[in-house]
Interface confidence: low
Amino acid sequence: CEEPPTFEAMELIGKPKPYYEIGERVDYKCKKGYFYIPPLATHTICDRNHTWLPVSDDACYRETCPYIRDPLNGQAVPANGTYEFGYQMHFICNEGYYLIGEEILYCELKGSVAIWSGKPPICEKVLCTPPPKIKNGKHTFSEVEVFEYLDAVTYSCDPAPGPDPFSLIGESTIYCGDNSVWSRAAPECKVVKCRFPVVENGKQISGFGKKFYYKATVMFECDKGFYLDGSDTIVCDSNSTWDPPVPKCLKVLPPSSTKPPALSHSVSTSSTTKSPASSASGPRPTYKPPVSNYPGYPKPEEGILDSLD
């Protein structure tokens, strides 16, 4: 037989020879970093057909590193599910906690003992410093100095000194988030007042009010014979402007008899949909007449006679 087989986990006892006689036996021992667990054989014999009898290093087990418990509020996840040397231990913190220390420890061989490459990390609770103070307003728990993960504060505005109240711009509630950062910027308190929305040939059908402060919502419809150019619903935004802009009501012109009939008039009706762009609520109640979709057909405001052949 030629030289006996080599293995990852065990090595030949003694020096290998260039050839071996039939019946000759060679013995193996577990390599450094491995330990033997009976009963599997760790020897082989040169067989009559000049091959070595089957042998494997399955009896040699890798040394394993000491048990590591899950960090409090986290997990220790052994790579490949093993504590054997050469493998890693990954540490993960639960939601609301962050890792202090090494995210990965390595099971290393020191002499013949497997030990971890460092100290296991700890999972520290996510803490936030107090949220920002805001002008003309305050937040709940203002006396608290340290906030824990998902702790929330709610802002409110002070009474205004003048006739118009302060409006809270932004989300009133913010919470202590993942990276010890508040979930969003603090809101602001300021006077927001939009102009009265005037629509010629139309009328406001909801959202009536003496004044239109932040987030005031108004809906419109056009008079008979007019169609709405723009959105039927507008909102007072933080810049004291209407969003979208106040719509217009444009006159519907009569169609030509030689062309596909145009809609004679369009009267806007009240919509319950606050988002005009939403298609989920079905057809919008106010729309432009379909005549403008036909090539060569005049737009309603251009007048029919001007473009006849």
Epitope: F35, I37, E63, T64, P66, Y67, R69, L72, V113, A114
Partner: antibody, heavy 118, light 107 residues
């Protein structure tokens, strides 16, 4: 060197409850991982559970439903609360400082005897 | 839970004798085994941790060996003060468990 002294043992009827204390002197109980171990002639040494310095706990599942380990840092004392006691819980109970975070026990107290009998 | 079985359950030796106690685990525990001695009327005391490491203050006549499932505690020359019950303990897996003990007496 911290010394641990167990107390609170005594005679209790089956089904009763008992709270054992483990007072630390010469050091802070919160600075050490504290295990509770019991010993009886019939069952030998049994590890009951541990409270770690960070306040986390691990239990021997055989006792988890009945035994609770806690700590009061202000009193510098660890506790073992035992409920629904059975006659087989009769044993000497030791509180034990875990050796530098490794699970070998180098600092045994003198133990406190708990007898469960009617 | 991992079971630890010690043998013999008791032995009697003369001062100066070599004493061997074995501890067998129900599954492989690598080298995560400790040995304790409980002298009469006292609490247990740590002798050896991690199979073969002597705890501070323990005389070097004590030695430990083994790996996997079979472990041995040897006292090279037993002395009168070595009487008591010897326990092995594994810590590879919760719950940590102890052997049933080996009682050593001096003839």
């Amino acid at each position: 060197e911290v010394q641990l002294v167990e107390s609170g043992g005594g005679l209790v009827q089956p089904g009763g409850s008992l709270r054992l204390s483990c007072a630390a002197s010469g050091g802070s109980v919160s600075s050490y991982d504290i295990s509770w171990i019991r010993q009886s002639p019939s069952r030998g040494l049994e590890w009951l559970g541990v409270i770690w310095t960070d306040g986390g706990t691990n239990y021997n599942s055989a006792f988890m439903s009945r035994f609770t380990i806690s700590r009061d840092d202000s009193k510098n004392t660890a506790y073992l609360q035992m409920n629904s006691l059975k006659t087989e819980d009769t044993a000497v109970y030791y509180c034990e400082r875990v050796y530098d975070g490794y699970p070998w026990f180098a600092y045994w107290g003198q133990g406190t005897l708990v007898t469960v009998s009617s | 839970a991992i079971q630890l079985t010690q043998s013999p359950s008791s032995l009697s030796a003369s001062v100066g004798d070599r004493v061997t106690i074995t501890c067998r685990a129900s599954q492989g525990i690598s080298n995560y085994l400790n040995w304790y001695l409980q002298k009469p009327g006292q609490s247990p005391q740590l002798l050896i941790y991690y199979t073969s490491s002597l705890h501070s203050g323990v005389p070097d006549r004590f030695s430990g060996s083994g790996s996997g499932t079979d472990f041995t505690l040897k006292i090279s020359r037993v002395e009168a003060e070595d009487v008591g019950v010897y326990y092995c303990q594994q810590y590879i897996k919760l719950p940590w468990t102890f052997g049933q003990g080996t009682k050593v007496e001096i003839k």
